[in-house]
């Protein structure tokens, strides 16, 4: 029986050219997390595997950074980044938990974004 719940950052907005943290938390289950996939619609952005660590899809390497934690940081945002993002937790023995985040990238500076991840 799947007892876990996923808490996400929900619907968020960010400024064009800025960065944003996508964050999901799985709680209320003793299942072991074996892998977390981050996906945008039908595209795989990144994988965080319990045994192999992080892997960023080659096509997103320049704009996607792992973390903080099991989250994902999107950088150099464009309006085309607007859309749905999914965190998919693969667990044993529960199975798969999925969280949804909707990101809106805005042209103006009214968006709220607070990524703390820095690339030197």
């Amino acid at each position: 029986m799947m007892t876990g719940t996923i808490e996400t950052t929900g619907n968020i907005s960010a400024e064009k050219g800025g960065s944003i943290i996508l964050q999901c938390h799985l709680s209320s289950t003793t299942a072991q997390v074996t892998q977390v996939n981050w996906e945008q619609q039908d595209q795989l952005l990144a994988i965080c595997n319990a045994d192999l660590g992080w892997h960023i899809s080659p096509s997103f390497k320049d704009r996607v950074a792992p973390g903080p934690g099991l989250g994902l940081t999107l950088q150099s945002l464009t309006v085309n980044d607007t859309g749905e993002y999914f965190c998919i937790y693969h667990t044993y023995p529960d199975g798969t938990y999925t969280g949804r985040i909707f990101l809106e990238v805005l042209e103006s500076s009214v968006a709220e974004h607070g990524a703390r991840f820095q690339i030197p």
Partner: antibody, heavy 116, light 106 residues
Framework: QVQLQQSGAELMKPGASVKISCKAT????????IEWVKQRPGHGLEWIGE????????NYNEKFKGKATFTADTSSNTAYMQLTSLTSEDSAVYYC?????????WGQGTSVTVSS | QIVLTQSPAIMSASPGEKVTISCSAS?????IHWYQQKAGSSPKPWIY???NLASGVPARLSGSGSGTSYFLTISSMEAEDAATYYC?????????FGGGTKLEIK
């Protein structure tokens, strides 16, 4: 097996800088965060910040910005933390730890003593 | 930042006694981790994500809680459980630790 081997104890003068190393073996260094944690007697554990060796991306606790600087060398699988302008408040044991969801492997700690 | 307050700071328990350590968060978190540290050694992961025991941790230990209140329980105290226990949150940056609970054996 996974191991994090830290450099030895340091005795430093106030105002000096120190660079602590953390050599990782037994896993793919570039794919995991390395965290740095400070422990002073009676003060528990304090998170300093983290570095992702694969990209050089860093994340600092605001309290330690300007005090600590992280670097990583993927050719030698070694992470470094430099502490500057040392004072007696910096006297502590410093740990590096691997992070993936939690701090699953820790170094043995490096003792830094600041004394004139 | 999220402040984690552990209680008690120090406690002693007799062999076979039930022990409960609490970790209170200043705002709600999804889960916490617990670490065990013995004198002269590095901390070790002890309980992951509130209730998942790390490899090699005896089944007499358990973790529970949600929101702002979390607990580590030892159903029957043994000498090897004497150590300092720290809770930690990975909910929001900066990651923070509790002040620690030193558990001694009578």
């Amino acid at each position: 097996q996974v191991q994090l081997q830290q450099s030895g104890a340091e005795l430093m003068k106030p105002g000096a800088s120190v660079k602590i190393s953390c050599k990782a073996t037994g896993y793919t260094f570039s794919r995991y965060w390395i965290e740095w944690v400070k422990q002073r007697p009676g003060h528990g554990l304090e998170w300093i910040g983290e570095i992702f060796p694969g990209s050089g991306g860093t994340n600092y606790n605001e309290k330690f910005k300007g005090k600590a600087t992280f670097t990583a060398d993927t050719s030698s699988n070694t992470a470094y933390m430099q502490l500057t302008s040392l004072t007696s408040e910096d006297s502590a044991v410093y740990y590096c730890a691997r992070h993936l969801g939690a701090l699953d492997y820790w170094g043995q700690g490096t003792s830094v003593t600041v004394s004139s | 930042q999220i402040v984690l307050t552990q209680s008690p700071a120090i406690m002693s328990a007799s062999p076979g006694e039930k022990v409960t350590i609490s970790c209170s968060a200043s705002s709600s978190v999804s889960y916490i981790h617990w670490y065990q540290q013995k004198a002269g050694s590095s901390p070790k992961p002890w309980i992951y994500r509130t209730s998942n025991l790390a490899s090699g941790v005896p089944a007499r230990l358990s973790g529970s809680g949600s929101g702002t209140s979390y607990f580590l329980t030892i159903s029957s105290m043994e000498a090897e459980d004497a150590a300092t226990y720290y809770c930690q949150q990975y909910h929001s940056n900066p990651w923070t630790f509790g002040g620690g609970t030193k558990l001694e054996i009578k």
